[in-house]
């Protein structure tokens, strides 16, 4: 139990103001009422409290709200948010995007802390899905946010939210994540015309299957090498030399510089050398002329 000391005469806080910065820890405990603090949380941020004083204020709120803070208090926490533990945050029910933004602002410029990760998790779970506005907000503060989610979590992203995703938001996504996001992007952008569609879908192509790459090769898209290198190896391997040439357009010359790296290396090994020679790039490692290519995967499927 907390040691209780009476508030000295004349020190009882009637409002939350600058005079409180001169209070010792025990005086804050004895003289600041938690219910008063809760009603004036918006003032706390403007007062230069020490970390020790902020600890007392946090304990005051814990006293008032043992089952977790209400949103009316959470939205005004400001720097007091940095004092919260993930366990504290798990008790909250945050439904307002404005509240989320206010708290993310406090942590701006720092790595995503366990507190922020817990807050985002509570918020998204409360909403049931990652809607466009939420995704917009989260990726604005944390460009790598989307790629920090598991494929299972990404499955809750509705296609309409994909419009909020910027290319840089996908920089750290692995193929498993792009496998989930690509079909959603395809659905989201399906009504766009060829060139516009490609601009939007390009960042997601690391999750595209072979048949979609073949279709793109018929649309003069001129895919850059950076995008090509991020494609799924298993999606690239069945592409013919002619299809890759159409897919890359003028960028096809870049294959030479990448011939030792996947997926280019593996793709070269699957092509006939005389087909590769038609590119005039000096790509080596294809199947020598006169050799028979057996597709073992097809053989296994038939047997």
């Amino acid at each position: 139990e907390v040691e209780k000391t009476a508030c000295p005469s004349g020190k009882k806080a009637r409002e939350i103001d600058e005079s409180l910065i001169f209070y010792k820890k025990w005086e804050l405990e004895a003289c600041v009422d938690a219910a008063l603090l809760a009603t004036q949380m918006d003032r706390v941020n403007a007062i230069p409290f020490t970390y020790e004083q902020l600890d007392v204020l946090k304990h005051k709120l814990d006293e008032l709200y043992p089952q977790g803070y209400p949103e009316s208090v959470i939205q005004h926490l400001g720097y007091l948010f940095l004092k919260m533990s993930p366990e504290d945050i798990r008790k909250w029910n945050v439904t307002s995007l404005e509240t989320l933004k206010a708290l993310l602002e406090v942590n701006k410029g720092h790595e995503m802390s366990p507190q922020v990760a817990t807050l985002i998790d509570r918020f998204v779970k409360g909403r049931g899905q990652l809607d466009k506005d939420t995704l917009d907000t989260l990726t604005a503060f944390y460009p790598g946010y989307l790629c920090s989610l598991s494929p299972e979590e990404l499955s809750s992203v509705p296609p309409s939210s994909i419009w909020a995703v910027r290319p840089q938001d996908l920089d750290t996504c692995d193929p498993r994540q792009l496998d989930v996001l690509y079909p959603k992007a395809r659905l989201a952008f399906q009504n766009m015309n060829g060139s516009e569609y490609f601009v939007k879908i390009q960042s997601f192509l690391g999750g595209a299957p072979t048949e979609d790459l073949k279709a793109l090769s018929q649309q003069n898209v001129s895919m850059d090498l950076a995008t090509f290198m991020k494609l799924r190896t298993d999606a690239v391997l069945p592409l013919t030399v002619a299809e890759v040439q159409k897919l890359l357009g003028p960028h096809v010359e870049g294959l030479k510089a990448e011939e030792r790296h996947r997926p280019v290396r593996d793709w070269i090994l699957r092509q006939r050398q005389d087909d590769l020679d038609t590119l005039g790039l000096g790509l080596q490692g294809g199947i020598p002329n006169g050799y028979l290519v057996l597709d073992l995967s097809m053989q296994e499927a038939l047997s």
Epitope: E1, K4, C7, A35, T39, E63, L64, P66
Partner: antibody
């Protein structure tokens, strides 16, 4: 079931003292703000005082400040109101009530105990 | 101190009629901190509405609260015989947590 039971009321002379008690049950007393509210005969409700659960921070109406002291014993789940220097205008039914911080309201009330200050 | 002024002082109505009770604050009160109570003769008050518009547990939906800033309203859509009582508003924004002086709803 939440229950609040006041006791300690009675007849007292002006200038005298009285201590009211409120026994609480059916909820986590150690987590809850508690209040006293009074009602003079035929009049409206008047908030008197409250006390926080952990730090026992107290607040009072100006009309009782310096004369009344609210306190609590969390081990006994009991709230107290020590009333000194009583005046005729303190005559009222005194209610003990639980303050629900999440609702910012008094959500459970005792049945009240009558304090009469008269010579 | 925040002063709450309730009007009218007395409201004479018949069962089945609509009752509209007003509570005006001397300064702005966040709706999160405004509550309404009902008190019948010889009984303790009972919480009806908290947060200006949320009904407390077990309160019939004929009771509703509204308002913000300095003006708040308690509405009883169709008066039942058991609704004739005194109604109080209270603010918990600043100390002291003041009550209004009450509105008596009596049978016409």
């Amino acid at each position: 079931e939440v229950q609040l039971l006041e006791s300690g009321g009675g007849l007292v002379q002006p200038g005298g003292s009285l201590r009211l008690s409120c026994a609480a049950s059916g909820f986590t007393f150690t987590h809850t703000y508690m209040s006293w509210v009074r009602q003079a005969p035929g009049k409206g409700l008047e908030w008197v005082s409250n006390i926080s659960p952990t730090y026992s921070t107290t607040n009072y109406a100006d009309s009782v400040k310096g004369r009344f002291t609210i306190s609590r014993d969390n081990n006994k789940n009991t709230l107290y109101l020590q009333m000194n220097s009583l005046r005729a205008e303190d005559t009222a039914v005194y209610y003990c009530a639980r303050y629900n911080a999440y609702h910012a309201a008094l959500d459970y009330w005792g049945q009240g105990t009558l304090v009469t200050v008269s010579s | 101190e925040i002063v709450l002024t309730q009007s009218p002082g007395t409201l004479s109505l018949s069962p089945g009629e609509r009752a509209t009770l007003s509570c005006r604050a001397s300064q702005s009160v966040s709706s999160s901190y405004l509550a309404w109570y009902q008190q019948k003769p010889g009984q303790a008050p009972r919480l009806l509405i908290y947060g200006a518009s949320s009904r407390a547990t077990g309160i019939p939906d004929r009771f509703s609260g509204s308002g913000s800033g300095t003006d708040f309203t308690l509405t009883i859509s169709r008066l039942e015989p058991e609704d004739f009582a005194v109604y109080y508003c209270q603010q918990a924004l600043g100390y002291p947590h003041t009550f209004g002086q009450g509105t008596k709803v009596e049978i016409k």
